[in-house]
C-alpha cells in the first residue's frame, strides 16, 4: 500500500524559517502534489503550494519556495513573519495524486520538544482518497 511521509523541520540558523518535506512511497508516477496547512486539502486546510511535474509550481504566502527533491518527494520552505511562531503548532499535510489510481495524504507537525535543526521522524498516517 502506498504511503506518504511528512517531516517538518525548523531551521537552526533562522528560528522563523521552517521546511516541510514530503515523500511518496509506492509505485506509480506522481501527477500532482498539494501541500496545505491547518488540515487536509479540501477538509478545512488551506493550500500552501501545488506542484505539477510538467506544469510547474504555485505557492502562496507564507510559503517561500516549493521544489521537487526527487521524482517522488518535495520540499516547501516557509517564512514565519510573526513573532509568535504559529508554525510550531500547525499541522501540515501533503497529498500525492497518482492519476488515475487515486491520491494519498498524510499530515505532520513540528514536535513540541524539537530543537532547532531537528526534524520530526517520518510517521506516515495515510489517508486514502480515491479521487
Amino acid at each position: 500500500t502506498p504511503e506518504v511521509w511528512v517531516q517538518v523541520q525548523m531551521e537552526a540558523t533562522e528560528l522563523s524559517s521552517f521546511t516541510v518535506h514530503c515523500g511518496f512511497l509506492g509505485p506509480g508516477s506522481i501527477s500532482l502534489v498539494t501541500v496545505s496547512w491547518g488540515g487536509p486539502d479540501g477538509a478545512g486546510g488551506t493550500k500552501l503550494a501545488v506542484l505539477h511535474p510538467e506544469l510547474g509550481t504555485r505557492q502562496w504566502a507564507p510559503a517561500r519556495q516549493a521544489r521537487w527533491e526527487t521524482q517522488s518527494s518535495i520540499s516547501l520552505a516557509l517564512e514565519d513573519s510573526g513573532a509568535s511562531s504559529p508554525f510550531a503548532n500547525t499541522t501540515f499535510c501533503c497529498k500525492f495524486a497518482s492519476f488515475p489510481e487515486g491520491s494519498w495524504e498524510s499530515c505532520g507537525s513540528l514536535p513540541p520538544s524539537s530543537d532547532p535543526g531537528l526534524s520530526a521522524p517520518p510517521t506516515p498516517v495515510p489517508i486514502l482518497r480515491a479521487d
Epitope: 500532482l32 488551506t46 502562496w60 492519476f99
Partner: nanobody, 127 residues
Amino acid sequence: EVQLVESGGGLVQPGGSLRLSCVASASGFTYRPYCMAWFRQAPGKGLEAVAGIDIFGGTTYADSVKGRFTISRDNAKNSLYLQMNSLRAEDTAVYYCAAGDSPDGRCPPLGQGLNYWGQGTMVTVSS
C-alpha cells in the same frame, strides 16, 4: 462552506465589452480551487461551458467565444475574471462561476467535476 460570488453583469450594446468577476471564499480556511470556470445559460436554453482556467494558468474556451472572451484568475485573491469583448445578442445569458479540484491540477472537460457554483450574474446584450 465555500461560496462563489459573481459580479459585473449588466446591459451592454452589441459590440460592447463587459468584465465579470468571481470571488471564492470559505469559512475558516482559504479555498484555492485547482480549476475555475465560467458557464452561461441563455433564456430557455441549457447550461453551456464558456471558459475554464486551471491553477497553473492553462485555459480552455468554447468555440463560440474564442477570440472574443478572455478568462483569467488571480490565485492570491482567489478571484476569477472574464473579459468579454465584441459582445453579441446571442451572448445574453446568466453567467455562472464554478470551481473545483481535479486529480492532476488541470481543468477537467468543462462541466465535469466542478462542485461549487455561484448564483450567477445577468448579462444582456441589446441595442
